[in-house]
């Protein structure tokens, strides 16, 4: 008995060939001996089966002795043994229809679980293997689960169903809803304008939701809301913004925030949360702000940074084109009685400069002591 695997919703063509290469009488029946279709001369006739409106044949092939049964929009319950009766012969074809669906939705939030469920006919014992867009293989039976979806899991998942040494392939497009970056850090000199951007890693026709940027300033004892907003069909409208700092928000995607000036009291870290329509859970992106200030007070030249810096970052003070006068893994460095000239304060990571602030030290003219 020949075995043919089909996919739910697809079309299958079951073949039946006569030894004579001409149009002769044939019938297709199911295992209950109910006629599905056949011919009467050059006419196609249909029986009382459940497949009535979905069954067809290819009349153009009859003259060549081929009498296929075409079943459209396959259903799991179409799985059966189909019998072709031609020239006093019976050809049996076992059709097994499988379906593979993703749980609830193919648009899932980062960190959520993806469950793929295999629909299969009674009595079958298929095995399933799926390959993710990043090449990860998962195997299972009726259900396959992937926990903690990552951004790289977005794309086409290819799943192969194996039954009776035959295989059928399914392709499922999964969209992982996430920000492009889980975390970002902005380095700014005091007084500079700060731009925060929160690009999404997916595109959808309509995007509706709401969000908030919640901020913990390093120098503040508690965190607070900096801005709340709504998103309607990709249009952003600000709901409420704190008075200090007075943030501005772009009206279009990607989500974009502007802080008029970087000040030490704003340095810290924030969490932008976005709730999307028809989604359980929220998208998050962490954003960090590091602010640098270089000052000269009397005979003391000081450079300070505020905000979340890693312990391996180096803060240095150096006179232009000279070796660093002071270099420490600390958040403040200073030089007493600095020489005149252009001084540079540098925040660097393994030699790479992340932030630089220049300050000019003027020469101090010592007034001669009067006799």
């Amino acid at each position: 008995k020949k075995v043919v695997l089909g996919k739910k919703g697809d079309t299958v063509e079951l073949t039946c060939t006569a030894s004579q290469k001409k149009s002769i009488q044939f019938h297709w029946k199911n295992s209950n001996q109910i006629k599905i279709l056949g011919n009467q001369g050059s006419f196609l006739t249909k029986g009382p089966s459940k497949l009535n409106d979905r069954a067809d044949s290819r009349r153009s092939l009859w003259d060549q002795g081929n009498f296929p049964l075409i079943i459209k929009n396959l259903k799991i319950e179409d799985s059966d043994t189909y019998i072709c009766e031609v020239e006093d012969q019976k050809e049996e074809v076992q059709l097994l229809v499988f379906g593979l669906t993703a749980n609830s939705d193919t648009h899932l939030l980062q960190g959520q679980s993806l469950t793929l469920t295999l629909e299969s006919p009674p009595g079958s014992s298929p095995s399933v293997q799926c390959r993710s867009p990043r090449g990860k293989n998962i195997q299972g039976g009726k259900t396959l689960s992937v926990s903690q979806l990552e951004l790289q899991d977005s794309g086409t998942w290819t799943c192969t169903v194996l039954q009776n040494q035959k295989k059928v392939e399914f392709k499922i497009d999964i969209v992982v809803l996430a920000f492009q970056k889980a975390s970002s850090i902005v380095y700014k000199k005091e007084g500079e304008q700060v731009e925060f951007s929160f690009p999404l890693a997916f595109t959808v026709e309509k995007l509706t939701g709401s969000g908030e940027l919640w901020w913990q300033a390093e120098r503040a004892s508690s965190s607070k809301s900096w801005i709340t907003f709504d998103l309607k069909n990709k249009e952003v409208s600000v709901k409420r913004v704190t008075q200090d700092p007075k943030l501005q928000m772009g009206k279009k995607l990607p989500l974009h925030l502007t802080l008029p000036q970087a000040l030490p009291q704003y340095a810290g870290s924030g969490n932008l949360t976005l709730a999307l329509e028809a989604k359980t859970g929220k998208l998050h992106q962490e954003v960090n702000l590091v602010v640098m200030r270089a000052t000269q007070l009397q005979k003391n030249l000081t450079c300070e940074v505020w905000g979340p810096t890693s312990p391996k970052l180096m803060l240095s003070l150096k006179l232009e084109n000279k070796e660093a006068k002071v270099s420490k893994r600390e958040k403040a460095v200073w030089v007493l009685n600095p020489e005149a000239g252009m001084w540079q304060c540098l925040l660097s990571d393994s030699g790479q400069v992340l932030l630089e602030s220049n300050i000019k030290v003027l020469p101090t003219w010592s007034t001669p002591v009067q006799p």
């Epitope: 508690s222 809301s225 949360t273």
Partner: antibody, heavy 119, light 107 residues
């Protein structure tokens, strides 16, 4: 520790006036929106009014518009509710509330002060 | 004004039971929904913000879901201290409005 302490409640005749005060401590009062929420005896909660950080924005429920005025004094860390032309239906426990929670949530509530409007 | 309708208005349950309270907004409010718990003679306590995010310190047996107009608060396994009245509140537009409350009573 965040603390909100209401005062000024009491018995007043219909048509009369009352001024509620709320003393705030344990947080930077001038950084937060503040609200008044009331609860009639045995009934549910009703938001009454709120005010932004510098007092420039104020919103009220329709039933108190033109009769109640919300105000604040950031130097004194105090929130006020001036209630005029009081009616029997204004009888309730009045709560002073901080709007400091994520997503505009009302995160800290005072213990409430009872206002009874009756002849 | 946006009307908030809670159901049921009261529910009798036993310790360990799963309790679900629903809240429906008369128009879409996105995720601007907060849940509060109030015990007799006490001020309300803030439980859940943005429809589904748990306020820190609130036990994980409490959970919220929903977006737009339909929201739910679920207590997965009722504890003795959970017998109280629960209110939903919208912060989408002024005037802010509360649901009428759902009283969770001991069966």
């Amino acid at each position: 520790e965040v603390q909100l302490v209401e005062s000024g409640g009491g018995l007043v005749q219909p048509g009369g006036s009352l001024r509620l005060s709320c003393a705030a401590s344990g947080f930077t009062f001038s950084s937060y929106w503040m609200s008044w929420v009331r609860q009639a005896p045995g009934k549910g909660l009703e938001w009454v009014a709120n005010i932004n950080q510098d007092g420039g924005e104020k919103y009220y429920v329709d039933s108190v518009k033109g009769r109640f005025t919300i105000s604040r004094d950031n130097a004194k860390n105090s929130l006020y509710l001036q209630m005029n032309s009081l009616r029997a239906e204004d009888t309730a426990v009045y709560y002073c509330v901080r709007e400091g929670g994520q997503w505009l949530a009302l995160d800290y509530w005072g213990q409430g002060t009872l206002v009874t409007v009756s002849s | 004004d946006i009307q908030m309708t809670q159901s049921p208005s009261s529910v009798s349950a036993s310790v360990g039971d799963r309790v679900t309270i629903t809240c429906r907004a008369s128009q879409g409010i996105s995720s601007w929904l907060t849940w509060y718990q109030q015990k007799p003679g006490k001020a309300p306590k803030f439980l859940i913000y943005a429809a589904s995010s748990l306020q820190s310190g609130v036990p994980s047996r409490f959970s919220g879901s929903g977006f737009g107009t339909d929201f739910t608060l679920t207590i997965s396994s009722l504890q003795p201290e959970d017998f109280a009245t629960y209110y939903c509140q919208q912060a989408n537009s002024f005037p802010w409005t509360f649901g009428q409350g759902t009283k969770v009573e001991i069966k």
